[in-house]
Interface confidence: low
Amino acid sequence: LNTTILTPNGNEDATTDFFLTSMPTDSLSVSTLPLPEVQCFVFNVEYMNCTWNSSSEPQPTNLTLHYWYKNSDNDKVQKCSHYLFSEEITSGCQLQKKEIHLYQTFVVQLQDPREPRRQATQMLKLQNLVIPWAPENLTLRKLSESQLELNWNNRFLNHCLEHLVQYRTDWDHSWTEQSVDYRHKFSLPSVDGQKRYTFRVRSRFNPLCGSAQHWSEWSHPIHWGSNSSKENPFLFALEA
Amino acid sequence: AVNGTSRFTCFYNSRANISCVWSQDGALQDTSCQVHAWPDRRRWNQTCELLPVSQASWACNLILGTPDSQKLTAVDIVTLRVMCREGVRWRMMAIQDFKPFENLRLMAPISLQVVHVETHRCNISWKISQASHYFERHLEFEARTLSPGHTWEEAPLMTLKQKQEWICLETLTPDTQYEFQVRVKPLQGEFTTWSPWSQPLAFRTKPAALGKDT
């Protein structure tokens, strides 16, 4: 189990998300050229893409990927069964839900099949690499003459996600943003009925079930209020 | 048996203070009474002197430590007793097994300030005081604005269902004096209640520029 260790007052010890180990570099032969770094993301805990920059190779090379889970029941080395390609060269691997074990150390190994000594291993904490789908079904409820409540849904365990709400009016230069915990609702307690408001939300797998840094895509925006009748330079910049 | 109706209510501020109110019909005003706190799993105990706040009610604050120290958790149970002196002896008037994180009332928000004011809007910020780190972001707020010619009781409540320590008040009248208050509540606790209202913050909107509608 890979964990973030916290002392009782909430101070975190630093933990790294991956480790790179390459073969020793005595001379710069092909076998000692560094392999590209593998980047993995777990999409909504439905599938995982592990990708690398295939164009960083000196010549087009179909690198192979193996993976396993360290110190667990799933520690048997597995071959990638579903490669992703970039211009007919392997550039990634897709793993399906049944192959994803969020709370075990995921070990990924990239290898040059023509130079078997040329390999690099990384250890990843998958719970820190989850990217949820964008929030859906944004709805606005009028609580009173001047108050709005924004609600949304996520296709995931709600308590695992935190959210970022952004809103702006047709008179604003920039978005106003506010973080929201797992409750997936946001109150705007004072609105101006003469302005048109736009809201959008994104979500992140943090902090209760993981420590992911990456946010989901933004939701589709939702609007409220009337278009301002006054001439307004920002009116058409809402989606910028 | 204790004569008359007795009511003993206490709240924990989530850090190092338990505030109690005891009311007793027909109690003697000049009786000396105390609240004793005995936690079930801590080495300390604490006492405070009940002081009259009305004809038949007394209040006191149990100071458990420095203001920001975390003295209790959700597994603690504190036995609270009201003890009154009767001659040379102490008599127990009320008792309760107090679960601190089921009976929360935070301190009123502090440091209210105007961040930015215009003719029709005003941005105000505040800070929470002595709130446990256990809450993380699991807090909500209510706010109200006092307009000229109205009372606080008439002011509509504004709800913030998220931990947001600022507000942008819209549709204000230019060149007008307002007051603003905010209060806070944790999500946790069956008997948890709102904090007292903050000290009011007075502010004035900017006057409208002549010949312009801002």
Partner: nanobody, 119 residues
Framework: QVQLVESGGGLVKPGGSLRLSCAAS????????MSWIRQAPGKGLEWVSH????????YYADSVKGRFTVSRDNANNSLYLQMHSLRAEDTAVYYC????????????RGQGTLVTVSS
Amino acid sequence: QVQLVESGGGLVKPGGSLRLSCAASGFTFNDYYMSWIRQAPGKGLEWVSHISSSGSTIYYADSVKGRFTVSRDNANNSLYLQMHSLRAEDTAVYYCARGDAVSITGDYRGQGTLVTVSS
């Protein structure tokens, strides 16, 4: 109703190991943070360790860090505490407690299991 039953305690020599278990029932186990807390003879309650509902975030008291490992099996509604390099000062009644996202030390706890570390 909520029930937490600890087991696995006993007498062990200094430097030895024990594994405590906690069987939970009466609530949706994988919705809750869980903790281990302990009480040494004649002393106050000491919080030992805490694990989030999914097992992704773990807290340890400084006194046990590096020696104790908390884990959970949500499928079997079970919480575990693996204890290595036990010392005399680890002698205590160990309780399993149900927590939540707000208060890590919980709202319900079991009857406890006694761990005695002595030569």
